[in-house]
């Protein structure tokens, strides 16, 4: 194929790949008709003047995962057709001025995972056709004004995983075509008002894992096309009332891992497209009426690992499409009987790790599609008669680690568990806590003939009792709810996967569906 270097492989499709530790310089001679060249995992430490001079038809050049620390300014001379250039995962600390001069066709420039200490306006001033610029995983401490002023066609800019402590409000002002801006994992403490005003086409803004304490009220008011906003793992303690008011296209908002103490009614919205709202690991203590009422299409609401002790009966008004509600690991002692009444499409609810002492008989009365209820590790001694009767799709119920009182009043719950066991998975069985003569015994195998008569009047539900085990040939499909593998945080759907750390941390939100989380 027009002379392929021995250290490389060359395909008929004009693709050349050179890999291996024994390569210490750009191999020669490279086929003159090469359109794609990859130099990966070598010991090349520098690029000298014009090593690619004879392959002017090159469209894509990947020089990744090498020992590259020095590049001569004329290294990419004569590559006027080059559209894609990656220098990612090398050891570059400095970029020579003029390095990208003459790369008039360049659309994607990947400089991620190096050791770059600074960038200057002159670095990219010739790259007027650039659409994608990846600078994440470097050591940048600031971005000078004008650094991106010539990149008017830029649609994706990743500055994540650097050491940025502040951002100038003018640095992005000319990026009117930008769709994706990533600033995650820096040291930003605040974002000046107006920083994002020029980004009228922005669809994704990633600000997670910084140290942001305050959001300016109008910070996002010009970003009407924003679809994904990641604000998790910051120090945000309050949300200005109008901060999310102008985001009608938003479909993903993460606020977990902040210091939010309260949520005011109407703070979210209108956001007719928001499907998921992640608020776990904050300091929220109560939920007022109508706090989520603008989120008509919300399907996933994660409020776990807060300090919620009170939920107003109308807190979940408007959430008619909600499928998953996570309230686990809070301080709930009581729930109003109507609190879930509007959640007609709810499938999974996690209430474990609270202090619930009792549940109203009608708590799930209107939530007929529930498939999973998690109530383990509360202070429940019994449950009202008929509480699950109408839940024909229920196929996971967790009740263990509660102080069940196994007197005669427990019989309806015991019978329900026994008669419905094929629908309820094989989780840990509930165990009696009292009276003393049955402590430690499984609730479903206590000897009913020595069960102590109750000394109080059991609660009777106010809604009609209906059979919960309808006489059908088979139980509901227990595979309809997937495994309980849970993810630590929303996977923030990046093409550069360096930020994603998926774990199997069952403690985070305790749902039954593995969310892209």
């Amino acid at each position: 194929y027009h002379g392929c270097p021995s250290e490389c492989t060359c395909s008929r499709a004009s693709q050349v790949e050179c890999t291996g530790a024994r390569i210490v310089a750009v191999p020669t001679p490279l086929p003159w008709n090469a359109m794609s060249l990859q130099i990966l995992n070598t010991h090349i430490t520098e690029l000298n003047e014009s090593p690619f001079l004879n392959i002017s038809a090159l469209i894509a050049l990947r020089i990744e995962k090498n020992e590259l620390s020095r590049i001569t300014p004329g290294a990419f001379r004569n590559l006027g057709s080059l559209r894609y250039l990656s220098l990612a995962n090398n050891k570059l600390q400095v970029l020579p001025i003029g390095l990208f001069q003459g790369l008039d066709s360049l659309e994607s420039l990947l400089l991620s995972s190096n050791q770059l200490l600074q960038i200057q306006p002159a670095h990219f001033s010739q790259c007027s056709n650039l659409k994608e610029l990846q600078l994440h995983g470097n050591h940048l401490e600031y971005i000078p004004d004008g650094a991106f002023d010539h990149l008017v066609g830029l649609t994706k800019l990743n500055l994540g995983k650097n050491s940025l402590t502040h951002i100038s409000p003018r640095v992005f002002q000319h990026l009117g075509n930008l769709q994706v801006l990533r600033l995650y994992e820096n040291r930003l403490t605040d974002i000046p008002m107006g920083t994002f005003d020029g980004l009228v086409n922005l669809q994704e803004l990633a600000l997670q894992q910084n140290q942001i304490g305050l959001l300016s009220p109008g910070l996002f008011h010009n970003n009407h096309n924003l679809q994904r906003l990641y604000l998790s793992n910051n120090h945000i303690s309050q949300l200005p009332p109008s901060v999310f008011m102008q985001l009608p296209q938003l479909n993903r908002l993460t606020l977990f891992g902040n210091s939010l103490k309260e949520l005011s009614p109407g703070i979210f919205g209108p956001m007719p497209n928001l499907r998921e709202l992640w608020l776990y690991d904050n300091h929220i203590s109560s939920l007022p009426d109508n706090v989520f009422s603008n989120l008509r299409q919300l399907q996933v609401l994660i409020l776990s690992r807060n300090q919620i002790s009170f939920i107003s009966p109308g807190a979940f008004n408007g959430l008619t499409e909600l499928r998953e509600l996570s309230l686990h690991t809070n301080a709930l002692q009581d729930l109003d009987g109507n609190v879930f009444r509007m959640l007609a499409n709810l499938q999974n609810i996690s209430l474990q790790n609270n202090r619930l002492r009792q549940l109203p008989g009608n708590i799930f009365a209107n939530v007929n599609g529930l498939m999973a209820i998690q109530l383990q590790n509360n202070q429940l001694e019994n449950l009202p008669l008929g509480i699950f009767d109408h839940l024909g799709k229920l196929c996971e119920l967790r009740l263990y680690d509660n102080p069940w009182r196994c007197d005669s009043d427990i019989l309806p719950l015991r019978n329900w568990l026994l008669l419905n066991q094929p629908r309820l998975g094989t989780d840990t069985v509930p165990v009696c806590f009292s009276p003393a003569n049955v402590r430690g015994q499984s609730l479903i195998i206590i000897n009913v003939n020595v069960a102590v008569p109750s000394v109080h009047v059991p609660e009777v539900p106010s809604y009609p009792e209906t059979p919960w085990y309808p006489d059908t040939p088979s139980y509901p499909d227990t595979t309809s709810v997937s495994s309980t593998t849970e993810l630590t945080s929303p996977v923030e759907d990046y093409t550069d996967l360096t930020t994603i750390q998926v774990t199997d941390d069952r403690s985070v939100w305790g749902m039954t569906q593995a969310q892209s989380g």
Epitope: S408, L411, P412, N415, L418, L419, Q421, P422, T426, D427, T428, V429, S442, I444, I445, V448, N449, E465, P467, W468, Y469, P470, D471
Partner: antibody, heavy 113, light 111 residues
Framework: QVQLQQSGPELVKPGASVKMSCKAS????????IHWVKQMPGQGLEWISY??????KYNERFRGRATLTSDKSSSTAYMELNSLTSEDSAVYYC????????WGQGTTLTVSS | DIVMTQSPDSLAVSLGERATINCRAS??????????MNWYQQKPGQPPKLLIY???NQGSGVPDRFSGSGSGTDFTLTISSLQAEDVAVYYC?????????FGGGTKVEIK
């Protein structure tokens, strides 16, 4: 003490129906399941159905021919069998609780022309 | 349906000796870590009587000489010291899922 008192023996013709009863005493009727079990002469035991708070579950072999009902005010469970044949001649027991911990004395059904 | 197979069909044991009856289920009858296997005794002309529930728990008023063991698919009823009043037919039964099914029975006699 817990007791399940079943109705007396029945002699019926093929094609007819029969309704037998099981009256519970000595415990809270609504707190326990009532099962029905069939035993043909000299044979083993076969589960028919259960009823609990008006909810029922049937063995497919008896679906459509056995109907379980109960009267909470009299603490009595009933089983009706229809379209009877000689194969239905058997002793029918009611039993209490999920684990069948107490049994009635049985109702003998004879189907003969 | 879960099929329950008892063995032996009949068993003759001397008074005071141990009697062992086996029961095998066609699939596991375990749930929640509990085996939903029950044993009943039926004497001639009488209804069955619950001896053992959930594999190893004694029913009310059942003498200590009756014990149950096993998990999954294989279970055993043991009469540690056979008494004359133990002459009966013994049935195993699974209550893991509907239809609840019984074994064919084991007749225990005095040798």
């Amino acid at each position: 003490q817990v007791q399940l008192q079943q109705s007396g023996p029945e002699l019926v013709k093929p094609g007819a129906s029969v309704k037998m009863s099981c009256k519970a005493s000595g415990y809270t009727f609504t707190s326990f399941v009532i099962h029905w079990v069939k035993q043909m002469p000299g044979q083993g035991l076969e589960w028919i159905s259960y009823i609990y708070n008006d909810g029922t579950k049937y063995n497919e072999r008896f679906r459509g021919r056995a109907t379980l009902t109960s009267d909470k005010s009299s603490s009595t469970a009933y089983m009706e069998l229809n379209s009877l044949t000689s194969e239905d001649s058997a002793v029918y027991y009611c039993a209490r609780d999920y684990y069948f911990d107490y049994w009635g004395q049985g109702t003998t059904l004879t189907v003969s022309s | 349906d879960i099929v329950m197979t008892q063995s032996p069909d009949s068993l003759a044991v001397s008074l005071g000796e141990r009697a062992t009856i086996n029961c095998r289920a066609s699939e596991s009858v375990d749930y929640y870590g509990i085996s939903f296997m029950n044993w009943y005794q039926q004497k001639p002309g009488q209804p069955p009587k619950l001896l053992i529930y959930a594999a190893s728990n004694q029913g009310s008023g059942v003498p200590d000489r009756f014990s149950g063991s096993g998990s999954g698919t294989d279970f055993t009823l043991t009469i540690s010291s056979l008494q004359a009043e133990d002459v009966a037919v013994y049935y195993c039964q699974q209550s893991k899922e509907v239809p609840y099914t019984f074994g064919g029975g084991t007749k225990v006699e005095i040798k």
